[in-house]
Interface confidence: low
C-alpha cells in the first residue's frame, strides 16, 4: 500500500482543486496536518483536509448525486412528458372531429334542428373533453342531457312542426317523456355504454402517464441523507486528502455505495415494473368500444340512427305525448321527407390516405415499447450512476474509501466501513416519505389499470359488446368502423392521420418544454447544472 504523503510535502494540488469548489483558501492547510477533527475522511496519517473542507465535500457530493440522478432519468422523463402532451392534444382533436361530424350530420339531414342541436352537441363534447381531463362528470348524465335537450327540439321541429307558439311551454314535459317512453329506443343506452367505456380507458391512460411524470419527478428531486453524503464523500473526495488526485473509486465499491444510497429508490422497482406491464395491458385492450377514437368518431351515425328511430315511431309517439303533455287539441302529425340513407358532406370526412399512416393506437403501442425498455430503470439505477461517474476499470489500482488498493475486495471495504458507520443500517431505514407516497400512488394506479384492462383472450361475440348491443359490422383490422349501426355506417381507412395533423394543430407555444417563459424550476435546474459542472468530481 502506498505510504501517506510525507509531512514536509505541500498541499498544493489539493488547494488548487478545492479552490474550484470554494473560492478562497482559508480552509485548506498549506502542509499536511494530523486531521484529528475529521469525521468522514479519517486519516491514517497527515492529511490535506480540514473539517470545513469535509463539510463542503459532503454538500458537493450530494449535489453531484442529485445531478447524476436527474441526468439518468432525463430521457425517460422526456419520453413520458412528450407523449402525455401528444396524446392529450390528439384526444382533443378526436373530440373536435367528432363534434364537427355530428354537427355536419344535423346540418345536412336535419337543418331545422340547428342551431339548437349545435349548442347541445357543443355542450356534450365540452363535457367529454372535461371528463377526459379528470372532471367528476357522470357520463350517463352527459348522454341523458344530450337526448333530453334534443327531444323537445325534434318533437316541435320534426314530428309536430305545426305546433302553435302557445304550446311550446311543454319543454319539461317532453324531457320527462323522452325517458319514460324510451323515445330513442336503446340508442342512448348504447351510447352510454360505448362512451363511458372508451372515455374511462382514455382518462385512466392519461392519468397513468401523468403519474409516470410524477414518479420520475419525485425520484428526480430526492434529497440524499447525510449518511449517503458521507459515503459519497469518502468515495469521491477522501482520496484528495491524501494527495491522490488522479485515483478513481473501485467499480465494485461504487456499486455498494450506490446501493446503500439508493436503497429507498430501488424499492419503487417492483411497482414501476407492474405499472409498465399494466399500462401495456390497458393499451392492448384499447380497441372497439374501448377506443375513444373509434367510438366518438362513430357517434354522429348512432345519433342519426336514434333520430330515425324516433321518426319511424312518430305516429304512436305523437298521440301518446299529446295525452301525456296535455295539448289542448290533438294535432295531425306531419313531417318532411328525410332520406333513409345518411348523407355526409364529403368535405367534412376528407381524410388523408397515406400508406402506413400512424394512428393513435400505433402511437400508443410505440410508447409502450419504448417504456418497456425502461422497465428495469429503478433496479438498474445504482449501476447506471456508477457507469456515468468516474470508476476504475477492472477494479484494479483504485480507491476503496480508505486507501489505494491493487484489487477491490468487497469484504475488506465493508469491514473498513463498519467502524465509521453501518451500511446495513442505512439500508434498513426504509424509503423516504415521498418515496412511500409515490409507491402508494403507483399501487393505486396499478389497481385501476388492472380493473380497466380487458380480460386476456376475451373475444367479443361477433358484433355484440358485453351489454348485448350491436356495435356495427367492424370486421377486418385495416378498416376501422366509424359508426354505430345500420346503413348509415361509414368506413374510414385507418381512421384519421392524427399525428400528421398534430403538426398542424398543436400550438407549439403550448407544448411542455416549449414555453418561452422559464418556470422557476427551469431557472433552478440551469443554475444547478452550472453548479454541477464546477463541482463535478469527474476527472
Amino acid at each position: 500500500q502506498p505510504p501517506p504523503p510525507p509531512p514536509d510535502a505541500t498541499c498544493h494540488q489539493v488547494r488548487s482543486f478545492f479552490q474550484r469548489l470554494q473560492p478562497g483558501l482559508k480552509w485548506v492547510p498549506e502542509t499536511p496536518v494530523p486531521g484529528s477533527d475529521l469525521q468522514v475522511c479519517l486519516p491514517k496519517g497527515p492529511t490535506c483536509c480540514s473539517r470545513k473542507m469535509e463539510e463542503k465535500y459532503q454538500l458537493t457530493a450530494r449535489l453531484n448525486m442529485e445531478q447524476l440522478l436527474q441526468s439518468a432519468s432525463m430521457e425517460l422523463k422526456f419520453l413520458i412528458i412528450q407523449n402525455a402532451a401528444v396524446f392529450q392534444e390528439a384526444f382533443e382533436i378526436v373530440v373536435r372531429h367528432a363534434k364537427n361530424y355530428t354537427n355536419a350530420m344535423f346540418k345536412n339531414n336535419y337543418p331545422s334542428l340547428t342551431p339548437q342541436a349545435f349548442e347541445f352537441v357543443g355542450e356534450f363534447f365540452t363535457d367529454v373533453s372535461l371528463y377526459i381531463l379528470g372532471s367528476d362528470i357522470n357520463v350517463d348524465d352527459m348522454v341523458n342531457e344530450l337526448f333530453d335537450s334534443l327531444f323537445p327540439v325534434i318533437y316541435t321541429q320534426l314530428m309536430n312542426p305545426g305546433l302553435p307558439d302557445s304550446a311550446l311551454d311543454i319543454n319539461e314535459c317532453l324531457r320527462g317523456a323522452r325517458r319514460d317512453l324510451k323515445v330513442f329506443g336503446n340508442f342512448p343506452k348504447l351510447i352510454m355504454t360505448q362512451v363511458s367505456k372508451s372515455l374511462q380507458v382514455t382518462r385512466i391512460f392519461l392519468q397513468a402517464l401523468n403519474l409516470g411524470i410524477e414518479v420520475i419527478n419525485t425520484t428526480d428531486h430526492l434529497k440524499f441523507s447525510k449518511d449517503c453524503g458521507r459515503m459519497l464523500t469518502r468515495m469521491w473526495y477522501c482520496s484528495y486528502c491524501q494527495g491522490l488526485m488522479m485515483v478513481k473509486p473501485c467499480g465494485g465499491y461504487c456499486n455498494v455505495v450506490m446501493q446503500g444510497c439508493m436503497a429507498g429508490v430501488v424499492e419503487i422497482d417492483k411497482y414501476w415494473r407492474e405499472y409498465i406491464l399494466s399500462l401495456e395491458e390497458l393499451v392492448n385492450g384499447m380497441y372497439r368500444i374501448y377506443d375513444m377514437e373509434n367510438v366518438l368518431l362513430g357517434l354522429f351515425s348512432t345519433i342519426h340512427d336514434s333520430i330515425q328511430y324516433v321518426q319511424k315511431n312518430a305516429g304512436k309517439l305523437t298521440t301518446t305525448i299529446g295525452k301525456l303533455c296535455a295539448h289542448s287539441q290533438q294535432r295531425q302529425y306531419r313531417s318532411a321527407y328525410y332520406p333513409e340513407d345518411l348523407f355526409i358532406d364529403k368535405k367534412v370526412l376528407k381524410v388523408a390516405h397515406v400508406e402506413h399512416e400512424e394512428t393513435l393506437s400505433s402511437r400508443r403501442r410505440e410508447l409502450i415499447q419504448k417504456l418497456k425498455s425502461f422497465i428495469s430503470f429503478y433496479s438498474a439505477l445504482p449501476g447506471y450512476i456508477c457507469s456515468h461517474s468516474p470508476v476504475a476499470e477492472n477494479d484494479t489500482l483504485c480507491w476503496n474509501g480508505q486507501e489505494l488498493v491493487e484489487r477491490y475486495s468487497q469484504k475488506a471495504a465493508r469491514n473498513g466501513m463498519k467502524n465509521q458507520f453501518n451500511l446495513h443500517e442505512l439500508k434498513m431505514k426504509g424509503p423516504e416519505p415521498v418515496v412511500s407516497q409515490i409507491i402508494d400512488k403507483l399501487k393505486h394506479i396499478n389497481q385501476l389499470l388492472r380493473t380497466m384492462s380487458m380480460p386476456k383472450g376475451r373475444v367479443l361475440d361477433k358484433n355484440l359488446d358485453e351489454e348485448g348491443f350491436e356495435s356495427g359490422d367492424c370486421g377486418d383490422d385495416e378498416d376501422e368502423c366509424i359508426g354505430g349501426s345500420g346503413d348509415g355506417m361509414i368506413k374510414v381507412k385507418n381512421q384519421l392521420r392524427f399525428l400528421a395533423e398534430l403538426a398542424y394543430d398543436l400550438d407549439v407555444d403550448d407544448a411542455p418544454g416549449n414555453s418561452q417563459q422559464a418556470t422557476p424550476k427551469d431557472n433552478e435546474i440551469s443554475t444547478f447544472h452550472n453548479l454541477g459542472n464546477v463541482h463535478s468530481p469527474l476527472k
Epitope: 412528458i81 402525455a84 402532451a85 372535461l130 379528470g134 401523468n210 411524470i213 419527478n217 403550448d510 411542455p512
Partner: nanobody, 123 residues
Framework: QVQLVESGGGLVQAGGSLRLSCAFS????????MAWFRQAPGKGRDFVAR????????DYADSVKGRFTVSRDNAKNTVSLQMSSLKPDDAALYYC????????????????WGQGTQVTVSS
C-alpha cells in the same frame, strides 16, 4: 403568448385570511387549467390547488384542504385562491400556473408561470 400576473400577497397574522388573484392574458382562458404552487425559501415548489378549464373540477394539497379555496372567473380571465386560517407554514412565494393539456400536481405539466406573489404569516 400567455401571461400571468399574481397579486394579493402580503403580511398577515396567523389565523388570518388573504385572497390571491392571478390575471391571465394572451389566449382563450377557458381552455386552460390553472393551478397554484408555492415555494418556501430553500425548499422545492409544492402544489397547492388546481381548477379545471370550466371551474367545475378543483383539487387541493392535503395540507390546505378545508382552508383554501380555488376558483376562476372565465368572464374576467382570473383565477383566485382564498386562503383562511393561515399558519406560519403557509408563508411562501405563491405562483400561478397554466396548462392547456393534462393538469395534475406535477409542476412540469404546467407551461406558463407568473413571477409569484409573497405571502408572509407572522405568529
Amino acid at each position: 403568448q400567455v401571461q400571468l400576473v399574481e397579486s394579493g400577497g402580503g403580511l398577515v397574522q396567523a389565523g388570518g385570511s388573504l385572497r390571491l388573484s392571478c390575471a391571465f392574458s394572451g389566449r382563450t382562458f377557458s381552455k386552460y387549467a390553472m393551478a397554484w404552487f408555492r415555494q418556501a425559501p430553500g425548499k422545492g415548489r409544492d402544489f397547492v390547488a388546481r381548477v379545471g378549464p370550466s371551474g367545475r373540477t378543483t383539487d387541493y394539497a392535503d395540507s390546505v384542504k378545508g382552508r383554501f379555496t380555488v376558483s376562476r372567473d372565465n368572464a374576467k380571465n382570473t383565477v383566485s385562491l382564498q386562503m383562511s386560517s393561515l399558519k406560519p407554514d403557509d408563508a411562501a412565494l405563491y405562483y400561478c400556473a397554466a396548462t392547456s393539456g393534462i393538469y395534475g400536481e406535477s409542476y412540469n405539466l404546467y407551461n406558463y408561470w407568473g413571477q409569484g406573489t409573497q405571502v408572509t404569516v407572522s405568529s
